[in-house]
């Protein structure tokens, strides 16, 4: 075209893929009549007529633009819809009169790439690799033009570095004309990179200006040899017998090496391998004092068969031995004295306490309990507790039963039992003494006896309520080598309907079962009389 060299630079029109480009013919009225214009597309320096304007009316030429062109702005503007990357070219309008002039428009097309997809090497990177390894890939799909990629480590851009960092980027053109960019970050990593955060950033342009998209941050599995091995014990602090103790071998390498834990044998002075679980953890459950000792861990690199040894760790499982009380089975006369002595061994300083079994009342702080002027009531249980104050829960106890010689002592002297004629009564009588008493009844029936403890006995009697029995009542007699004692049970007839739940009664030990005639289940409640002051 004559004089083309002097032509001004084309007007720049920027538009996003998929939108409409407005191509305004910039010819002035003097340069040409806009009611008579031809529009051309220029591709590889070849012009193709795409649209004609005659008397302000537009007509598309057959071809790739046929369906996408229309006139706007009273014929001065050509609208190109559904812009694609292939539309990035020069468009020109040419006026026909008074003389042929043309106006050029450079159409620039943009498309933001999709979010970058970052992927980490699924196998990880060994620090001793001879060459930079593929650390991660970054893919930005469907952008136009080709976006630029920047790799970041811990927020800082990564630069090419000979034999250390290499960034390899390539692109493919999709059938749509859009670009997919793939960037591979190759690097030689060091141990400190195990916590490093990597991400990639895509920089691209749109008509609105420069933009960027960042990938998610990723960490890379980094493999490095073990340099240090150590033992950890859980729980931390003082250990005691009965605890669940875990001895764990740890190493600063990745992947962790193969571990074995051994315990020093004090007698042979040799280390004996302990059986660990699948995770290389030695579990002592329950821990015993025999578990105390010197433990160490050996870590093996199965590739090189090099082994590392941990610092030995002394494990102390604190214990309290069985508690011994002397005398073990004390017997005393009323009015006499008794000294109870408690002994135990421990890995720590012990504290002793004496408690009354029945009440948990603390009687003495110390290993010796002295009892003077013993009464019958002093008989029963005494508990020695040996404990380690510095280790909560570490204690052992021993119970000793003190027997006071004396004739039988009845649980009650008299008792009134409400009954109904022809009922089978279940009567009970309790006595204590030393030596242990036996109980007899003054009426015939089925009696059974059971020990409550070495000095106490409970006898139960099943008996049929007869008029004679109502008359005489029932007696139980307890006897031992030192004497005898009796309790009386008075039987009184009751109409069951008079015994309401509100009745001010105390349920006693006696109940009646079915009558011999009907064998129907019915019960009788006994009423306790107020207990006398002396029960001896």
């Amino acid at each position: 075209v004559p004089g083309e060299a002097e032509q001004p630079a084309p007007e720049l029109v920027e538009v996003e893929v998929g939108s409409t480009a407005l191509l305004k013919c910039g010819l002035s009225q003097s340069q040409g009549n806009l009611s008579h214009v031809d529009w051309f597309s220029v591709h590889k320096e070849k012009r193709t007529l795409i649209f004609r304007v005659r008397q302000g009316q537009g007509q598309s030429e057959p071809g790739e633009y046929e369906q996408r062109l229309s006139l706007q702005d009273r014929g001065a503007t050509l609208a190109l819809t559904q812009v694609t990357p292939q539309d990035e070219r020069i468009f020109l309008c040419q006026g026909k009169r008074p003389r042929s002039q043309e106006y050029r428009i450079q159409l620039r097309v943009y498309k933001a790439p999709e979010e970058p997809n970052i992927q980490v090497n699924p196998l990880g990177i060994p620090v001793n690799s001879k060459e930079p390894e593929e650390v991660a890939t970054c893919v930005g799909r469907n952008g136009y033009p080709i976006p630029q990629v920047i790799w970041y480590k811990n927020g800082r851009p990564l630069k090419e570095e000979k034999n250390r960092v290499h960034i390899q980027s390539s692109q493919t053109v999709e059938s749509s004309g859009l670009y997919t960019l793939q960037s591979i970050l190759k690097a030689q990593l060091v141990k400190e990179d195990k916590d490093a955060q990597f991400y990639c950033e895509l920089n691209y342009r749109l008509p609105s200006g420069n933009h960027m998209k960042e990938s998610r941050e990723v960490t890379v599995p980094v493999f490095y040899p073990t340099e240090k091995v150590w033992l950890e014990v859980e729980p931390v602090g003082m250990l005691k017998e009965g605890d669940r103790v875990e001895i764990r071998c740890l190493a600063d390498g990745n992947p962790p090496p193969h571990f074995s834990i051994s315990k020093g044998n004090p007698s042979t002075r040799e280390a004996e391998e302990e059986t660990t679980n699948d995770n290389g953890v030695l579990v002592l459950e329950p821990a015993r004092k025999e578990h105390s000792g010197r433990y160490e861990c050996q870590a093996w690199n199965l590739d090189t068969m090099i082994s590392l040894l941990s610092e030995p760790q002394e494990l102390l499982v604190n214990y309290v031995s069985d508690v011994r009380v002397s005398p073990a089975a004390p017997e005393r006369q009323e009015g006499s004295s008794l000294t109870l002595t408690c002994e135990a061994e421990s890995s720590q300083d012990l504290e002793f306490q004496w408690l009354r079994e029945e009440t948990d009342q603390v009687l003495e702080r110390g290993p010796v309990l002295q009892l003077h002027d013993l009464k019958r009531e002093a008989g029963g249980g005494y508990r020695c507790v040996a404990s380690v104050p510095s280790i909560p829960g570490l204690n052992r106890t021993q119970l000793v039963k003190l027997a006071i010689f004396g004739p039988p002592w009845m649980a009650f002297k008299e008792r009134k039992v409400w009954v109904k004629e022809n009922m089978v009564l279940n009567l009970s009588c309790e006595a204590s003494g030393h030596p242990r008493p036996t109980i007899s009844w003054n009426v015939n029936g089925t009696a059974s006896e059971g020990d409550q403890d070495p000095q106490r006995v409970l006898s139960t009697l099943n008996v049929l309520v007869t008029p004679e029995l109502l008359e005489t009542g029932v007696e139980c007699t307890a006897s031992n080598d030192l004497g005898k004692n009796t309790s009386i049970l008075f039987l009184e007839l009751v109409n069951l309907t008079t015994l309401t739940p509100d009745s001010n009664t105390t349920t006693g030990l006696s109940t009646s079962t079915a009558s011999p005639h009907t064998r129907a289940n019915s019960t009788s409640t006994e009423r306790k009389l107020p207990e006398p002051e002396s029960r001896g």
């Epitope: 997809n117 992927q119 699924p122 196998l123 001879k130 593929e134 890939t137 591979i184 190759k186």
Partner: antibody, heavy 116, light 106 residues
Amino acid sequence: QVTLKESGPVLVKPTETLTLTCTVSGFSLTSNGVSWVRQPPGKALEWIAAISSGGSTYYNSAFKSRLSISRDTSKSQVVLTMTNMDPVDTATYYCARHRPFYFDYWGQGTLVTVSS
Amino acid sequence: DIQMTQSPSSLSASVGDRVTITCKGSQNIYKSLAWFQLKPGKVPKLLIYDANSLQTGIPSRFSGSGSGTDFTLTISSLQPEDVATYYCQQYYSGYTFGGGTKVEIK
């Protein structure tokens, strides 16, 4: 074009060592890693080992103590050795190219039978 | 280890049918998933990588979707030559495959 071809014995005895070779063409072993994958009859695919473009080696921990993978870049070969073979190791063994983390090209596989 | 659960284990469909195979990861693998086609005596073929990218030379009737833990391979119109066993594979952490889906023609 990219091709991979596995070769090695079709029959090995229990306790013996299996050596398989993967010969590649159309790419360089210093540009792409190679993995070995196997498929026992009627079962799923199972990754065995890999050697990266930088020469780092990786093993499936289920077989680690029995495996060794190496390469000869001048011959474009990757070699897998598996010791102490057992009848359960009977499978079709494949080698596959990494691009860079997925497998884009595979060999046709070689069936290895372990039997006495 | 990441487990990949594929379903169904087998299916039978007519030529022209739309076929869907699913793969579920035991943890988030983002888009690190590939689909392969295996035919007896043939070289295994990569169909899809990065969960939804079609490998060069693979017919467009194959497509992949999903991210995170749930993925799908779709054959929009089943063809006789698509009879094969299909496997998913994660490459997020190590390499593990699904159990496979055998596709047959009714």
